[in-house]
């Protein structure tokens, strides 16, 4: 969490941002809140980005003002106009691109004063893994697949029964570039698995960590997946 205060003029207002990550090709949110004002027409929101000539987005007098919007962001940004009055200056960013990563500034002017806060935005690709039994293999084998990751992640297998065991000798991981030449499909195979055990396939890069679990018994197979973003810090 980053909390910024205005430093110029007689009055300052508190602006709060939260560092976050965007999944390329999908929509993302850059979070920013501020001390609300009672009059929408008195609120100015400016989003700026380090290295960008011009503005990422500007909202003033109750509407978007995009005359200085940089071409990199044209047609891809929106504020939640109905929530500005209650202090929400968050920016919706459509079709997140790798190049959107960087340091953003949320700058607010209201009748009470000015304030700003920076936000670190990371971009990459992350997806939920799915673990299945590979019935085509000669021995009991598990196959963990996740369709989109970037940058290249690490893959680690773990087992509930053999906690702390190193499975690198009995697993094989490959990365296949997807058609857009940036993200990659992750495939990891674990050999010599035993039944009545729960195995976890953990995929991690500097943006996200995802885990796919599979429990194999003689009577059933249970699966569970979850994904966690690693860098959500408020400022």
């Amino acid at each position: 969490l980053i909390i910024g205060f205005g430093i110029s003029g007689r009055h300052s207002i508190t602006v709060t941002t939260v560092a976050s990550a965007g999944n390329i090709g999908e929509d993302g949110i850059l979070s920013c809140t501020f001390e609300p004002d009672i009059k929408l027409s008195d609120i100015v929101i400016q989003w700026l980005k380090e290295g960008v000539l011009g503005l990422v987005h500007e909202f003033k007098e109750g509407k978007d003002e995009l005359s200085e919007q940089d071409e990199m962001f044209r047609g891809r940004t929106a504020v939640f106009a109905d929530q500005v009055i209650v202090g929400n200056a968050s920016l919706r960013l459509k079709n997140v691109q790798l190049t959107d990563a960087g340091t953003y500034k949320c700058y607010i002017i209201t009748s009470k004063g000015k304030g700003n806060a920076n936000l670190e935005y990371k971009t990459g690709a992350f997806s939920m893994p799915e673990v299945n039994v590979d019935y085509n293999a000669s021995s009991e084998t598990l196959r963990c697949e996740a369709p989109r990751w970037f940058p290249q992640p690490t893959v680690v297998w773990a087992s509930q029964v053999d906690q702390g065991a190193n499975f690198s000798e009995v697993s094989n991981t490959s990365f296949e570039l997807n058609s857009e030449n940036v993200t990659m499909k992750v495939v990891s195979v674990l050999y010599n698995v035993t039944i009545n055990n729960t195995y976890s396939c953990m995929i991690e890069n500097d943006i996200a960590k995802a885990t796919g679990d599979i429990k194999v018994t003689e009577s059933e197979i249970k699966r569970r997946s979850h994904l966690q973003l690693l860098n959500s810090k408020a400022s």
Epitope: G51, L53, G54, E68, Q69, L98, T99, G102
Partner: antibody, heavy 115, light 107 residues
Framework: EVQLVESGGGLVKPGGSLKLSCAAS????????MSWVRQTPEKRLEWVAG????????YYSDTVKGRFTISRDNVRNTLYLQMSSLRSEDTAMYYC????????WGQGTSVTVSS | DILMTQSPSSMSVSLGDTVSITCHAS??????IGWLQQKPGKSFKGLIY???NLEDGVPSRFSGSGSGTDYSLTISSLESEDFADYYC?????????FGGGTTLEIK
């Protein structure tokens, strides 16, 4: 067809001034952030200054800050670079171009600073 | 400032060859990199932007790749019009900075 045509270069004495122009046609000039880049006689490239699409935001390299001023006229579709207190190390071919190294570049105008 | 180290500074190659030019940034630039071509006595032509995107009208034998601090421009099956100077430029931060250039010469 997109065209960027620079003019205003020439021979000038150290301490002198020049104003470069870059006339744009064939593109919606007001949509794009623009830059001036220079190429030294040794072929080294140096970014000089940039300006936002509407002209309110400008950035300069440290080597020219306080001496050069970038501006634009979106009605006349023209980018400018006012250069003052010129030094011998400002000698270069000056190019205007669309920001981010994207396509559209002018053919350049030569600036020589020498006594 | 971000330092862009480009290599090689020159290379002698033959028609039909595949060549790669690399640029190393002194810090991560999140694919905020472009590649430019300059023919002798001429201006610049943008080839690649955002690390991997081909500018309109640029032949598909040109491709860009890389992430973090390391990026490359690859030209497959070189044609006679490809013999020129090539530069990378980063636009993650101000000031924009360029690589030192690579001259492709006919062997």
């Amino acid at each position: 067809e997109v065209q960027l045509v620079e003019s205003g270069g020439g021979l000038v004495k150290p301490g002198g001034s020049l104003k470069l122009s870059c006339a744009a046609s064939g593109l919606t000039f007001s949509r794009y952030a623009m830059s001036w880049v220079r190429q030294t006689p040794e072929k080294r490239l140096e970014w000089v200054a940039g300006i936002s699409s509407g002209g309110s935001y400008t950035y300069y390299s440290d080597t020219v800050k306080g001496r050069f001023t970038i501006s634009r006229d979106n009605v006349r579709n023209t980018l400018y670079l006012q250069m003052s207190s010129l030094r011998s190390e400002d000698t270069a071919m000056y190019y205007c171009g669309r920001e981010y190294g994207r396509d559209y570049w002018g053919q350049g105008t030569s600036v020589t600073v020498s006594s | 400032d971000i330092l862009m180290t480009q290599s090689p500074s020159s290379m002698s190659v033959s028609l039909g060859d595949t060549v790669s030019i690399t640029c190393h940034a002194s810090q991560g630039i999140n694919s905020n990199i472009g590649w430019l071509q300059q023919k002798p006595g001429k201006s610049f032509k943008g080839l690649i932007y955002h690390g991997t995107n081909l500018e309109d009208g640029v032949p598909s034998r040109f491709s860009g790749s890389g992430s973090g601090t390391d990026y490359s421009l690859t030209i497959s099956s070189l044609e006679s019009e490809d013999f020129a100077d090539y530069y990378c430029v980063q636009y993650a931060q101000f000031p924009r900075t360029f690589g030192g250039g690579t001259t492709l010469e006919i062997k």
